[in-house]
């Protein structure tokens, strides 16, 4: 569910939303740490209907969801985390 990408791309998100998305509509969450041309952390939510939403990393709901997913992944099955090396 959680994916962390380190890329050399510039910012991917033009507009960010803080609107809550229920877990049942989320396929995966992609986290792009700041750096490499983008001065901010970006969170991209891939919904089950194939649409993509950039979420404000400061939104309480996404912080809470990521924390719950992290806890779950450390206590049960590992959540897939994909990392790309910085060129």
């Amino acid at each position: 569910v959680l994916e962390v990408y380190y890329t050399s791309l510039r910012c991917r998100c033009v507009q960010e939303s803080s609107v809550f998305i229920p877990r049942r509509f989320i396929d995966r969450i992609q986290i792009l740490p700041r750096g490499n041309g983008c001065p901010r952390k970006e969170i991209i939510v891939w919904k089950k209907n194939k649409s993509i939403v950039c979420v404000d990393p400061q939104a309480e709901w996404i912080q809470r969801m990521m924390e719950v997913l992290r806890k779950r992944s450390s206590s049960t099955l590992p959540v897939p985390v994909f990392k790309r090396k910085i060129p």
Partner: antibody, heavy 120, light 107 residues
Framework: EVQLVESGGGLVQPGGSLRLSCAAS????????MSWVRQAPGKGLEWVAE????????NYAPSLKDRFTISRDNAKNSLYLQMNSLRAEDTAVYYC?????????????WGQGTTVTVSS | DIQMTQSPSSLSASVGDRVTITCKAS??????VSWFQQKPGKAPKLLIY???YRYTGVPSRFSGSGSGTDFTFTISSLQPEDIATYYC?????????FGGGTKLEIK
């Protein structure tokens, strides 16, 4: 004005079938997730099923998924619930509800309900 | 399934009173909670969504709070027209589930 109008309820014998309809007007029906919710006499609310705009994502209450089928026809602005092998405990008022993605899929509009009575 | 335990199941209060209803989820539902008002013979009406957001046209005396597993619905000053049954609902994950309801009566 948004309107959801359910129909198709009535008296049916145990083991019988019914098809409920929900006609939508005043909204871009093809844009919204929709749900069916039921309420047995004197009891609380129970979610039945939901369907996405494209009919590609469907979820059911686990206890009902073998007997109930949700579907929709966007061209007719209509939502349906096919109910088979009906039991006395399916007796309830059945509501259709819109789930607004701007309000994170909360059920913001409801129909007035249609009554299903399962009895011999 | 996520259970929503709502309390109290019934409540008697006077006009002008502050009324509080609580709902506890059996597991984390983030802020995926709605509160509905239902009057006899009528369909439920959405009052609060995403735990704390007041729906369009809902009077400011109605409010909601909470996240995770503990949620609260408050009527700051009870009015005669608020007599109804109130339900919480989680829509974080399927199956969607409702609390058992709180029947509110005037003293």
């Amino acid at each position: 004005e948004v309107q959801l109008v359910e129909s198709g309820g009535g008296l049916v014998q145990p083991g019988g079938s019914l098809r409920l309809s929900c006609a939508a007007s005043g909204i871009d029906f093809s844009r919204y997730w929709m749900s069916w919710v039921r309420q047995a006499p004197g009891k609380g609310l129970e979610w039945v099923a939901e369907i996405n705009p494209e009919s590609t994502l469907i979820n059911y209450a686990p206890s009902l998924k073998d007997r109930f089928t949700i579907s929709r026809d966007n061209a007719k602005n209509s939502l349906y619930l096919q109910m088979n092998s009906l039991r006395a405990e399916d007796t309830a008022v059945y509501y259709c509800a819109r789930q607004d993605d701007y309000r994170n899929y909360a059920m913001d509009y409801w129909g007035q309900g249609t009554t299903v009575t399962v009895s011999s | 399934d996520i259970q929503m335990t709502q309390s109290p199941s019934s409540l008697s209060a006077s006009v002008g009173d502050r009324v509080t209803i609580t709902c506890k989820a059996s597991q984390d539902v983030n802020t995926g909670v709605s509160w509905f008002q239902q009057k006899p013979g009528k369909a439920p009406k959405l009052l609060i969504y995403s735990a704390s957001y007041r729906y369009t046209g809902v009077p400011s005396r109605f409010s909601g709070s909470g996240s995770g597993t503990d949620f609260t619905f408050t009527i700051s000053s009870l009015q005669p027209e608020d007599i109804a049954t109130y339900y919480c609902q989680q829509y974080y994950s399927t199956p969607l589930t409702f609390g058992g309801g709180t029947k509110l009566e005037i003293k």
